[in-house]
């Protein structure tokens, strides 16, 4: 999960090692421009926030699907 609260600022210092179940993910956002490491934060149905690597294909696929919806 990102460190800090967002807003104001949440940053990710590691990424989830496993692919999240597609139907668990309800929203996403890029971490702040103040963060040293690029990351996408996925928000789950249960209200959890999970850090993911934006260069991973599954992350981009989920972002694309969420954007369409």
């Amino acid at each position: 999960a990102p460190m800090g609260s967002d807003p104001p600022t949440a940053c990710c210092f590691s990424y989830t090692a496993r692919k999240l179940p597609h139907n668990f993910v309800v929203d996403y956002y890029e971490t702040s421009s103040l963060c040293s490491q690029p990351a996408v934060v996925f928000q789950t149905k249960r209200g959890k926030q999970v850090c993911a690597d934006p260069s991973e294909s599954w992350v981009q696929e989920y972002v694309y699907d969420l954007e369409l919806n």
């Epitope: 967002d6 807003p7 104001p8 600022t9 929203d27 996403y28 956002y29 890029e30 702040s32 421009s33 103040l34 040293s36 690029p38 934006p54 260069s55 954007e67």
Partner: antibody, heavy 115, light 107 residues
Amino acid sequence: QVQLQQPGAELVKPGASVKMSCKASGYTFTSYNIHWVKQTPGQGLEWIGAVSPRNGDTSYNQRFKGKATLTADISSSTAYMQLSSLTSEDSAVYYCARGYGYDYWGQGTTLTVSS
Amino acid sequence: DVVLTQSPATLSVTPGDRVSLSCRASQSVSKYLHWYQQKSHESPRLLIKYVSQSISGIPSRFSGSGSGTDFTLSINSVETEDLGMYFCQQSNSWPHTFGAGTKLELK
């Protein structure tokens, strides 16, 4: 579809300031950072900085600190870049772009600083 | 800051040629290396993201490879519509930086 709309041109006098806009549509504005890039024939593409519309956080290239101020207005899905104390060196094309991969770009605003 | 060095500065090509454009980083940028094409009086357009990932709507003749500090954009059969400037860019660390570009022109 995703669009970033920028005015085509701005003509400003030396010493003045200018505030450029970048209106986003076709996606959730708060999900992506907006980046600003300067292009001049001599210098190529230069990253100015980025703003996070979600919370207003900004990150600047050291070279543009004090020159550029980045903001975002969620209500209008618009990002802004203000450039101050303009000189002829600031004459360039300025682009806004979306996200880490800069997958969408505005058409660019041509800034001319001239008396 | 990460310095990206592109070579050659200019590449003269004949339609049908296979060409390779190089981008070298002064330090590792991991997988966060992207390629853009810019035609005269147009905005840059994303061609390849994250070293080698293709972009919807971009012809399959464009491909990317490399890792760490050494990256290559390949065009396997150049067409006249491919003429223009090509830039690499890293988004691994702030400030994001661009290479100076490679100009693709007709021989």
